[in-house]
């Protein structure tokens, strides 16, 4: 009778095991082991027992002990079971961004691993088991479908293998795949709202605002604003599920014409875009030309108004005849024209909008000086010791300097409150002088003495 010990062994792949072959007869003719595995006999005393070291066990094997005794030949088998964890546990690659509401198929592939009867494949979201199946086939493949929800954003999906050798007195061996982090998003089907001026003047700044509601996660949304080839740099403010991107746009003469304003919102692997046209125009203020801005009284003055070739102008409210970019008027300068404003208003149609520009010039008329009876009376009679204010107003542009002197040396305090004394009496020569010339006028002050009864 041949026996083997141990009769059943579970060992890691590539491991070694000691197998003892025994026989019941004392003097067997033959005692040995039959196996394809590398073996080494350990020397023991006696003839009825042999110990072998079997090494580099790569797969399940059934070494057989045999003995030849006087009463006949017999055999006994030992069962070697090899265990090993899978060489590859992998989730099939997926785009990291997935739209909410989409069915997402998770596929786990497992290569290797034994014994398969003890190998299970588990699909997980975080620590939550989504599916558990035994490993079947090579490679083993386990799939499950997940309906992407908003609250899945940032969740980690993974695949785990469990080689459970606890019934064999060993442990539970786990292998986990690299996690797949799911980024969920919602990009509404409506395009972003774009608010901008329809027309923009060269060398000015305009404000462009692009906004969109119903985004998730809003902080991950990328906003691209551009006018033609000019990329704008917006300031973005975020709401719970909305954003508003505001940018200043500066345009130069090179941008003149119709330009395309675009706002693109990119979230996940989707985008929404809004296009709008902006007309960039050049419209300098009209030019008001006076033959001379400063003229002497009586001079003929031509006032011209010139504007953009396509503009229509009015000069001091009177439209150009014929209606067009030029208007002019002729006048003879009078003192009343001093400080008169000549206003030219130009209107230009740009992309259906009427643009208005104004320019004003003031005419300065030099005249005078003037001293007349109304503003500088020639005779004053005042009671002695009374309070009086001598008044004499000189007119002209520039405003003349006025001095009233008695005997070329005593001034009359014009516009000042004075106490009337005998010294004040006399004839004063009032002289008004400016760059336009000089006029004189005599003013007599009479002082009435109080009569004592």
């Amino acid at each position: 009778q041949t026996s083997v010990s141990p009769s059943k062994v579970i060992l890691p792949r590539g491991g070694s095991v000691l197998v003892t072959c025994s026989t019941s007869c004392d003097q067997p003719k033959l005692l040995g082991i039959e196996t394809p595995l590398p073996k080494k006999e350990l020397l023991l005393p006696g003839n009825n027992r042999k110990v072998y070291e079997l090494s580099n066990v790569q797969e399940d094997s059934q070494p057989m002990c045999y003995s030849n005794c006087p009463d006949g030949q017999s055999t006994a088998k030992t069962f070697l079971t090899v265990y090993w964890t899978p060489e590859r546990v992998e989730l099939a690659p997926l785009p990291s961004w997935q739209p909410v509401g989409k069915n997402l198929t998770l596929r786990c592939q497992v290569e290797g691993g034994a014994p398969r009867a003890n190998l299970t494949v588990v699909l997980l979201r975080g620590e939550k088991e989504l599916k558990r199946e035994p490993a079947v086939g090579e490679p083993a493949e386990v799939t499950t479908t997940v309906l992407v929800r908003r609250d899945h954003h940032g969740a980690n999906f993974s695949c785990r293998t469990e080689l459970d050798l606890r019934p064999q007195g060993l442990e539970l061996f786990e292998n986990t795949s690299a996690p797949y982090q799911l980024q969920t998003f919602v990009l509404p089907a409506t395009p972003p709202q774009l608010v901008s001026p329809r027309v923009l003047e060269v060398d000015t700044q305009g404000t462009v605002v692009c906004s969109l509601d119903g985004l998730f996660p809003v902080s991950e949304a990328q906003v691209h604003l551009a006018l033609g080839d000019q990329r704008l740099n917006p300031t973005v403010t975020y709401g719970n599920d909305s954003f508003s991107a505001k940018a200043s746009v500066s345009v130069t003469a090179e941008d003149e014409g119709t330009q395309r304003l675009t706002c693109a919102v990119i979230l996940g692997n989707q985008s929404q875009e809004t296009l709008q046209t902006v007309t960039i125009y050049s419209f300098p203020a009209p030019n008001v030309i006076l033959t001379k801005p400063e003229v002497s009284e009586g001079t003929e003055v031509t006032v011209k108004c010139e504007a953009h070739p396509r503009a229509k102008v009015t000069l001091n409210g009177v439209p150009a005849q014929p209606l067009g970019p030029r208007a002019q008027l002729l006048l003879k300068a009078t003192p009343e024209d001093n400080g008169r404003s000549f206003s030219c208003s130009a209107t230009l149609e740009v992309a259906g909008q009427l643009i208005h520009k104004n320019q004003t010039r003031e005419l300065r008329v030099l005249y005078g000086p003037r001293l007349d009876e109304r503003d500088c009376p020639g005779n004053w009679t005042w009671p002695e010791n009374s309070q009086q204010t001598p008044m004499c107003q000189a007119w002209g542009n520039p405003l003349p300097e006025l001095k009233c002197l008695k005997d070329g040396t005593f001034p009359l305090p014009i516009g000042e409150s004075v106490t009337v004394t005998r010294d004040l009496e006399g004839t004063y020569l009032c002289r008004a002088r400016s760059t336009q010339g000089e006029v004189t006028r005599k003013v007599t002050v009479n002082v009435l003495s109080p009569r004592y009864e």
């Epitope: 300097e401 001095k403 002197l405 008695k406 005997d407 070329g408 040396t409 005593f410 001034p411 305090p413 000042e416 010294d423 020569l429 002289r431 002088r433 000089e438």
Partner: antibody, heavy 117, light 110 residues
Framework: QSVEESGGGLVKPGGTLTLTCTVS????????MGWVRQAPGKGLEYIGI?????STYYATWAKGRFTISKTSTTVDLKITSPTTEDTATYFC??????????????WGPGTLVTVSS | AYDMSQTPASVEVAVGGTVTIKCQAS??????LSWYQQKPGQRPKLLIY???KLASGVPSRFTGSGSGTEFTLTISGVQSDDAATYYC????????????FGGGTEVVVK
């Protein structure tokens, strides 16, 4: 328009001295003319003025000792019985009050009078 | 009498500093006041007339103010060339006066 003094120099105390101011570029019938003096290291001192009409006006301290008169182009200052205290530079000035921004703008260069025995 | 008193008699100021000179009339002379600058050996030069009007060619750092009996000359951002004696002069009455000029203020620039 200009004014220039002449007649200064060394004079003995008690004598008589006349300084002359010659004007050009304006008429004395339109302007008053005054005399101002400045003793060495001292301030400006008003003596008197002759009006465009020919009337004269003097500082209180100058009455009786100084006489101002004029012709069509000159203005004279006569100093009677000068003392050493009358040693000064004498300026002829066009009265400012009629001037278009030229208060005492027209000053002569001055003439130095030294009273010494 | 229209007597003029001027203060201070002398003042020292650093380049870039400000100087204020005051002039007081014994009775109202309205705005008939002028200010002069005189440097040694030279005739006086008009700076301000009618109390606050700047004579032509005079730098704007010179300003005059006041009316009636109190007047002020201010020199701001003083320059070394401003070292001189400054006089006020009333231009209201030529008669019954001791002197139409103030006593003068010597400005020394450090």
């Amino acid at each position: 328009q200009s004014v220039e003094e002449s007649g200064g120099g060394l004079v003995k105390p008690g004598g008589t001295l006349t300084l002359t101011c010659t004007v050009s570029g304006f008429s004395l019938s339109s302007y008053a003319m005054g005399w101002v003096r400045q003793a060495p290291g001292k301030g400006l001192e008003y003596i008197g003025i002759i009006g465009s009409s020919g009337s004269t006006y003097y500082a209180t301290w100058a009455k009786g000792r100084f006489t101002i008169s004029k012709t069509s182009t000159t203005v004279d200052l006569k100093i009677t019985s000068p003392t050493t205290e009358d040693t000064a530079t004498y300026f002829c000035v066009r009265d400012p009050y009629d001037s278009y921004d030229a208060a005492y703008r027209l000053w002569g260069p001055g003439t130095l009078v030294t009273v010494s025995s | 009498a229209y007597d003029m008193s001027q203060t201070p008699a002398s003042v020292e100021v650093a380049v870039g500093g400000t100087v204020t000179i005051k002039c007081q009339a014994s009775q109202s002379i309205y705005s008939y006041l002028s200010w002069y600058q005189q440097k040694p050996g030279q005739r006086p030069k008009l700076l301000i007339y009618d109390a606050s009007k700047l004579a032509s060619g005079v730098p704007s750092r010179f300003t005059g103010s006041g009316s009636g009996t109190e007047f002020t000359l201010t020199i701001s951002g003083v320059q070394s060339d401003d070292a001189a004696t400054y006089y006020c002069q009333q231009a209201y009455s030529s008669s019954n006066v001791d002197n139409v000029f103030g006593g003068g203020t010597e400005v020394v620039v450090k």
